[in-house]
Each structure stands twice: as structure tokens, then as C-alpha cells.
């Protein structure tokens, strides 16, 4: 049976130029943590394997960062950057967990952030 | 220019354990992954195993847990494969493969291996 | 484990027409799929990498598509020299699966 549960930043906006961190923590469960993939919509753009390490996906080296932890970094965001993100957890043995944040990239240097979630 | 160079074919007996070489160059041997590909004669391509250089991590395809171990020597920039308790079914050749990513952009020439008594 | 299902199996075109392979992955691996060209007697070679990138110095007669679960791969007008068995493979998650692989050959 999945017990987990994923928390998310949830809903989040940025400036247009600036940076964003995108994070989810997987709870509730003592499933091993496999590996976490990152996508945008319908593009992988980051993984994270428990083995090997991050791998970032050469069309996104540019302006993706790994991490914080098991999280993401966007940079010089743009308009275009505005969708759903999903954290996509392979753990062992319960099976895969998703998280989904909403990010806004916003023209206007008054960007309000949403509350930030920090992993301890 | 990268290149990677595997060492040369193999006959074993069932039961045998072979260790395959793959030395690569032309680039910084610890910044990206080796995996190892097989090909039975007439079968599909079959992905074993990977090894992260830089930090040593490696993961396994479950049916070859056991049985298998990929090593890397950074000093040499040498990647090993080395696959225990042979049995026929295992007669193929084998690739070493530069991992960008999880897809494989350079291979070695292959190393065939032949599984008889 | 993802399971990759290519279809034809082999597939006879005729010199300039296209040719289509079709990947499917039996679950959800976003745009984690690559396309790899094997000669006989030769190591495999990448085409096409996260679904739609071509792979430096690869022909531009060579295009991929798709996302989830369903990919192609399209040769736009057939070269004698495409002549191979073409393989998708999923670097989604592991292990990194390959599919059955599509025979190309010349009408």
C-alpha cells in the first residue's frame, strides 16, 4: 500500500530574468528513494538517481541547476517558463509518487513569491 | 577525439567468470557515466549495468544482480565488466558505452563473448 | 521493468521516400527516449536523444517525435547508406530498456 505523501512549494511565481527553486519532499513512507525525475509539461528536463547522481538534460544545462537536496534550480527564467512542473518519485517498493507545482513568470519586477519550502 | 577501446574477444567454459576492458580518452573520463550493452545473436540490444567513474555508484539490471560488477579505475580511465557463472545463453557481444545523460553517445567496438564447452 | 514495443519489425522503402518507426513504452517516460542506428559488424550509433534532439553531425533527414509514451522516428527521403536496424530506448528510468528493433531495407 502507498502511505506517502508529496509536499510541493505549490503555486509560485518569479521575475522574468530571475531564479527559482523548485521543491518537493516525499513523507510519510519508508520507501527507498530510487530515483526523481523532474519534468516540465511534456519534457524531461533533470534526473536524479539514488546511484549515480544528477543528470541534467543537455537541451536545459544552460539554465537548470541540481538541487538544493533533490530539488531544482531554473535560472534566467522566462515568460515561456510559466507551466506545470512534476517531481515524479521511483521509490522501492511502493511505486511512484508525483508532485506538481504551478510556476508563473511574471514581466513585472513586483513577482510575488509563494511560501517557500525548505527540506530540513 | 573520444574514443573508447575494448579488450579483446573471449571464449570461456560454463561456469567461467570473464572481465571485459573498455579504456576510454579523449575526454574527462570522471564527468560522465559507462554502460554496458549486450547483443545475443539475434536478440535485441540489453542494457546490464552503469557506473558513475567520478563517484563510483553503479546500478544493476535486477536479472544480472550477482552476477555482474562494473568497476572503474580512474588513474587508467579504464571501466571493467566482469560477469560471473557464464552460462551459454550468455554467448553475445558486449559494448561499453559513454552514458550523457542516460543515453549513450560513444561506444566501444564491442567484445564478443563465446560461452561453450 | 518499461517495456519498449517497436513496430514494423522491418520495414522495405524505396530510395527517397520516408520511412517511419513507431516506439511504444508500456508506461509514462516523458521525453526519455533515444534512437540508435546498428549497422552489421558496427557499434550502434545515436541519432536522436530526449525524444526530438538530433545528435551532432546526424543527418537532418533524421527526426524524432512523441512524448508519454508514444514515439517515432521518421528517415524524410531513405539513403542506401540508412540501410540497418534502427533501436529506440527509454534513459527514463532503469534499466534502460530497448525496444525489438526495426529492420530497414530498400524496395
Known amino acids: 500500500m502507498m502511505t506517502g505523501t508529496i509536499e510541493t512549494t505549490g503555486n509560485i511565481s518569479a521575475e522574468k530574468g530571475g531564479s527559482i527553486i523548485l521543491q518537493c519532499h516525499l513523507s510519510s513512507t519508508t520507501a527507498q528513494v530510487t530515483q526523481v525525475n523532474w519534468e516540465q509539461q511534456d519534457q524531461l528536463l533533470a534526473i536524479c538517481n539514488a546511484d549515480l547522481g544528477w543528470h541534467i538534460s543537455p537541451s536545459f544545462k544552460d539554465r537548470v541547476a541540481p538541487g538544493p537536496g533533490l530539488g531544482l534550480t531554473l535560472q534566467s527564467l522566462t515568460v515561456n517558463d510559466t507551466g506545470e512542473y512534476f517531481c515524479i518519485y521511483h521509490t522501492y517498493p511502493d511505486g511512484t509518487y508525483t508532485g506538481r507545482i504551478f510556476l508563473e513568470v511574471l514581466e513585472s519586477s513586483v513577482a510575488e513569491h509563494g511560501a517557500r519550502f525548505q527540506i530540513p | 577525439e573520444v574514443q573508447l577501446v575494448q579488450s579483446g574477444a573471449e571464449v570461456k567454459k560454463p561456469g567461467a567468470s570473464v572481465k571485459v576492458s573498455c579504456k576510454a580518452s579523449g575526454y574527462a573520463f570522471t564527468n560522465y557515466l559507462i554502460e554496458w550493452v549486450r547483443q545475443a545473436p539475434g536478440q535485441r540490444l540489453e542494457w546490464m549495468g552503469v557506473i558513475n567513474p567520478g563517484s563510483g555508484g553503479t546500478n544493476y539490471k535486477e536479472k544480472f544482480k550477482g552476477r555482474v560488477t562494473i568497476t572503474a579505475d580512474k588513474s587508467s580511465s579504464t571501466a571493467y565488466m566482469e560477469l560471473s557463472s557464464l552460462r551459454s545463453e550468455d554467448t553475445a557481444v558486449y559494448y561499453c558505452?559513454?552514458?550523457?545523460?542516460?543515453?549513450?553517445?560513444?561506444w566501444g567496438q564491442g567484445t564478443t563473448v563465446t560461452v561453450s564447452s | 521493468d518499461i517495456v519498449m514495443t517497436q513496430s514494423p519489425d522491418s520495414l522495405a522503402v524505396s530510395l527517397g521516400e520516408r520511412a517511419t518507426i513507431n516506439c511504444k513504452a508500456s508506461?509514462?517516460?516523458?521525453?526519455?527516449v533515444a534512437w540508435y542506428q546498428h549497422k552489421p559488424g558496427q557499434s550502434p550509433k545515436l541519432l536522436i536523444y530526449s525524444a526530438s534532439y538530433r545528435y551532432t553531425g546526424v543527418p537532418d533527414r533524421f527526426s524524432g517525435s512523441g512524448s508519454g509514451t508514444d514515439f517515432t522516428l521518421t528517415i524524410s527521403s531513405l539513403q542506401a547508406e540508412d540501410v540497418a536496424v534502427y533501436y529506440c530506448q527509454q534513459h527514463y528510468n532503469t534499466p534502460h530498456t530497448f525496444g525489438g528493433g526495426t529492420k530497414v531495407e530498400i524496395k
Open positions: 558505452a559513454r552514458g550523457e545523460y542516460f543515453f549513450f553517445d560513444y
Open positions: 508506461q509514462h517516460v516523458s521525453t526519455g
